[in-house]
Amino acid sequence: LIIGFGISGRHSITVTTVASAGNIGEDGILSCTFEPDIKLSDIVIQWLKEGVLGLVHEFKEGKDELSEQDEMFRGRTAVFADQVIVGNASLRLKNVQLTDAGTYKCYIITSKGKGNANLEYKTGAFSMPEVNVDYNASSETLRCEAPRWFPQPTVVWASQVDQGANFSEVSNTSFELNSENVTMKVVSVLYNVTINNTYSCMIENDIAKATGDIKVTESEIKRRSHLQLLNSKAS
């Protein structure tokens, strides 16, 4: 969490941002809030990015003002116009690119004063893994697949019964480049699994951590997966 204060002749206002991560090819949110103003026409929001010649986005007098917007962001940005009056300056970024990563500044002017805060935005690819029993294999085998990751993650297997066991000798992980030549499909196979046990396939890079669990018993198979973004901190 980053909290910024304005420094000018006018009073300063508090602006708060939260570091976040964007999934390549999907839409992302750059979070920013500020002390609200009673008049929408008095609020100016400017989003800037380190290394970018133009503005990422500008909102003033109740509408988008894009004459100074950088070409790299043209047609890809929007604020939540109906929420500006309550102090939400968050930016929606469409079709997140790997190169959108970096330091952004949320700069606010209201009738109360000015303020700004920086935000670190990471980009990559992350997806939920799915673990299945591989019935084609000669021995009891589990197959963990996740369609899109970048940068290349690590994959670790764990088991509820054999806690702390190292499965690297009985697993094999491969990474296959997807058609857009950036993200990769992750496939990990675990051999010699036993029934009545819960196995976890954990995939992690510096942006996200995802886990796929599978419980195999004689009568049923239960699956569960979850994904967590790393390093989301407010400023």
């Epitope: 010649l53 133009g54 100074e68 950088d70 070409e71 790997l98 970096g102 950036v182």
Partner: antibody
Framework: EVQLVESGGGLVKPGGSLKLSCAAS????????MSWVRQTPEKRLEWVAG????????YYLDTVKGRFTISRDNSRNTLYLQMSSLRSEDTAMYYC???????????WGQGTTLTVSS | DIRMTQSPSSMSVSLGDTVSITCHAS??????IGWLQQKPGKSFKALIY???NLEDGVPSRFSGSGSGADYSLTISSLESEDFADYYC?????????FGGGTKLEIK
């Protein structure tokens, strides 16, 4: 076809001033960021200054800050670099560079030579 | 400032060879890197942007790869017109900075 044509280079004494121009054609000039990049006699490349499409935001290399001013006239499709307090280390070929739809170094002019010498 | 360390500074190669030029940034630049070509006595031509994307009209024998702080330009099956100087440039942060260049010469 995108064309960038630089002019205004020449021989200047240390401490002198000079203004470079870059005439642009073949694209919607006001939409794109522009930069000046120089190549020293040793062939080293240095980004000197940049300006956004609308002309309100400018950025400079620290060693030229306060001495050089980048500006643009979107009605004339022209980019400028006003240089003052020139030093011998400013001697270089100066290139006008345009952002395209892809990134900041898409299109390059042919360059204009600045020599600072007494 | 981000320092771009480019290597090698020069290389002698033969027609038909495959060559790789690398650039290491002093910090991560999230693929905000381009590759440029300069032929003797001429200006610059953009080859690659955003680390891996080929500019329009650039032959497919040119390719870019890398992530984080390490990037490379690969030219496969070199042709006579490819003998030139090559530079990387980062645009993740001001000031934009360039690698020192690689001179590709015919062996």
């Amino acid at each position: 076809e995108v064309q960038l044509v630089e002019s205004g280079g020449g021989l200047v004494k240390p401490g002198g001033s000079l203004k470079l121009s870059c005439a642009a054609s073949g694209f919607t000039f006001s939409r794109y960021g522009m930069s000046w990049v120089r190549q020293t006699p040793e062939k080293r490349l240095e980004w000197v200054a940049g300006i956004n499409g609308g002309g309100s935001y400018t950025y400079y290399l620290d060693t030229v800050k306060g001495r050089f001013t980048i500006s643009r006239d979107n009605s004339r499709n022209t980019l400028y670099l006003q240089m003052s307090s020139l030093r011998s280390e400013d001697t270089a070929m100066y290139y006008c560079v345009s952002q395209g739809s892809n990134y900041y170094f898409d299109y390059w002019g042919q360059g204009t030579t600045l020599t600072v010498s007494s | 400032d981000i320092r771009m360390t480019q290597s090698p500074s020069s290389m002698s190669v033969s027609l038909g060879d495959t060559v790789s030029i690398t650039c290491h940034a002093s910090q991560g630049i999230s693929s905000n890197i381009g590759w440029l070509q300069q032929k003797p006595g001429k200006s610059f031509k953009a080859l690659i942007y955003h680390g891996t994307n080929l500019e329009d009209g650039v032959p497919s024998r040119f390719s870019g790869s890398g992530s984080g702080a390490d990037y490379s330009l690969t030219i496969s099956s070199l042709e006579s017109e490819d003998f030139a100087d090559y530079y990387c440039v980062q645009y993740a942060q001001f000031p934009y900075t360039f690698g020192g260049g690689t001179k590709l010469e015919i062996k």
